[in-house]
């Protein structure tokens, strides 16, 4: 059928809440192309009805709840003018046992569910939210070993819990809560992470760790204003440049006649050990030549991008 | 449950490059800290360095000119190069993680170790 | 670089002699782990933050201490325990291992 596969790593999913996939594959999903998903191998599609259960949402696969009988490989196909990419999704589904203190961490999980915090530092966990702009998110509880994590070590800051000082008691199984709003109704997530300790100098030295972005497109208005944040963790004592790149050129010298596109004021807050450091770009006025073109954020040697990308038509306006 | 495996040659000729493959099953290398190990005859453990979850590299400054370890997470191994290897690199070279109870410094499993004779 | 100094380097003892080992750092370290190493075999990991066993590990061993003196100490000497005992720190880089304690039978 000429399609292109592309298989993505299984992923270990928690049944009874939501989960979501994203089909984005930069650069194929940059430009105007449909994206459709499917179950193991069906011709028919998944249902884009938003009071089904599963439906797609845009390029996103939505489970609302995941359900034990949703394992399984899913496929989105991705046609462009003159491409088209399967992507194959193998989704597995277990009972989750966050509270079971007789497993010693749960092995299989995604990387993104296993954690490290470093001995004698400040340091971070992340709460991975992946859901699509239809889903509202409220704030964010942190749990250890199934109580509430309290106490003046402990900060939450977005989709992050950041530890002061950590120790060796601090190592153990966390779960981040969060209810989710969609249509009205609310569902409970909740992401079990083990998180292991290390003494080791985490990047051995200064290497800055970019939060976002995380080569990942942004689905923008043509015409429209945007203003993207870059978030950078660095030690204090860094002497690291941050700032945001198009074609390997600084853009405010990129963009230096029309100054359409901008790069704001570097900001931070100081933690204990390291600094968070904010630099925004924006774009005065979307135009069709920003699509599919990679705007990279540099932090010292680390780098990360965005990409605009057009959204997918509505149907529902016809 | 974790395994590790090495392979690679047992000889290996003075000035020429060392190269050693550790092979995981049980757990993904693109978590925690992969570590390489070596023990000379009759003589103490040596440290030679690791690759992180991220594909950071340590290496033991008293090696650093001479080691390269890297990753390849398709297959789930990582690798050591020894370059310009003389007779004092004659040893068993294991690889070797951690994660017991949550301590990734806490090195738990080992492969069996594979000896490597520099000679001509 | 944090050196590390076992001792005794050998020691000879008796079944159900009590008996100790002491690593001590050139610096001050976080946590100490040990390993036990038998002939042809790979190290095992014995006991990790200072004091705690490893699975497997029997209750006659115990490890202590803080800052550059640590030990580790078995209660009751078994035939099984005869081995190689090597120390090791992960606070700083380059992360060492003592030099070894070769525990033999007298």
């Known amino acids: 059928d000429g399609c292109n596969d592309i298989f993505m790593k299984n992923e270990m999913l928690s049944a009874s809440q939501p989960f979501a996939f994203n089909c984005t594959f930069p650069p194929i999903t940059s430009g105007e192309v449909s994206v459709t998903w499917y179950k193991n191998s069906s011709k028919i599609p998944v249902s884009k009805i938003i009071q089904s259960r599963i439906h797609q949402d845009e390029t996103w696969i939505l489970f609302l709840p995941m359900e034990w009988g949703d394992s399984g490989v899913y496929q989105c196909v991705i046609k462009g003018r003159d491409s088209c990419h399967r992507i194959h999704v193998n989704l597995t589904v277990f009972e989750k046992q966050w509270c079971d203190t007789s497993v010693k961490g749960l092995p299989n999980l995604s990387d993104e569910y296993k954690q490290i915090l470093h001995l004698g530092k400040d340091d971070s966990l992340t709460c991975h939210l992946h859901f699509p702009k239809s889903c509202i998110l409220g704030p964010i509880k942190w749990y250890k070993d199934c109580n509430e994590i309290t106490g003046e070590r402990f900060t939450v800051l977005e989709t992050r819990l950041l530890v002061s000082n950590v120790s060796a008691e601090d190592r153990g199984n966390y779960a981040c809560q969060v209810i989710l709003t969609h249509s009205g109704k609310q569902y409970e997530v909740l992401n079990g992470i083990t998180v292991s300790i290390t003494e080791r100098a985490g990047y051995g030295g200064s290497v800055p760790k970019i939060i976002y972005p995380k080569n990942n497109s942004i689905e923008v208005q043509l015409g429209t204003t945007l203003i993207v944040d870059c978030n950078i963790t660095d030690t204090k004592d860094n002497t690291n440049l941050r700032c945001w790149r198009v074609n390997n050129t600084l853009v405010d010298d990129y963009y230096n006649e029309s100054k359409r596109i901008r790069e704001g004021v570097e900001t931070h807050a100081s933690f204990r050990e390291y600094n968070l450091y904010t630099v925004n770009i924006t774009f005065l006025e979307v135009k069709m030549e920003d699509y599919g073109l990679p705007f990279m954020c540099h932090a010292g040697v680390s780098a990360a991008y965005i990409m605009l990308q057009l959204p997918a038509p509505d149907f529902r306006a016809y | 449950q974790v395994q590790l495996q090495e392979s690679g040659p047992g000889l290996v000729k003075p000035s020429q490059t060392l190269s050693l493959t550790c092979t995981v099953s049980?757990?993904?290398?693109?978590?925690g800290y992969w570590n390489w190990i070596r023990n000379h005859p009759g003589k103490g453990l040596e440290y030679i360095g690791y690759i992180s979850y991220s594909g950071y590299t340590y290496y033991n400054p008293s090696l650093k000119s001479r080691v390269t370890i890297s990753r390849d997470t398709s297959k789930n191994q990582f690798s050591l190069k020894l370059s310009s290897v003389t007779a004092a690199d004659t040893a068993v070279y294991y690889c070797a993680t951690g994660g017991y109870d949550y301590v990734e410094d806490a090195l738990y499993y080992w492969g069996q170790g594979t000896l490597v004779t520099v000679s001509s | 670089d944090i050196q590390m100094t076992q001792s005794p380097s050998s020691l000879s003892a008796s079944v159900g002699d009590r008996v100790t080992i002491t690593c001590r750092a050139s610096s001050n370290v976080r946590y100490m782990y040990w390993y036990q190493q038998k002939p042809g075999k790979a190290p095992k990991l014995w006991i990790y933050l200072t004091s705690n066993l490893a699975s497997g590990v029997p209750s006659r061993f115990s490890g202590s201490g803080s800052g550059t003196s640590y030990t580790l100490t078995i209660s009751s000497l078994q035939p099984e325990d005869f081995a190689t005992y090597y120390c090791q720190q992960f606070t700083t880089s380059p992360y060492t291992f003592g030099q070894g304690t070769k525990l033999e039978i007298k």
């Open positions: 049980g757990a993904s290398i693109t978590s």
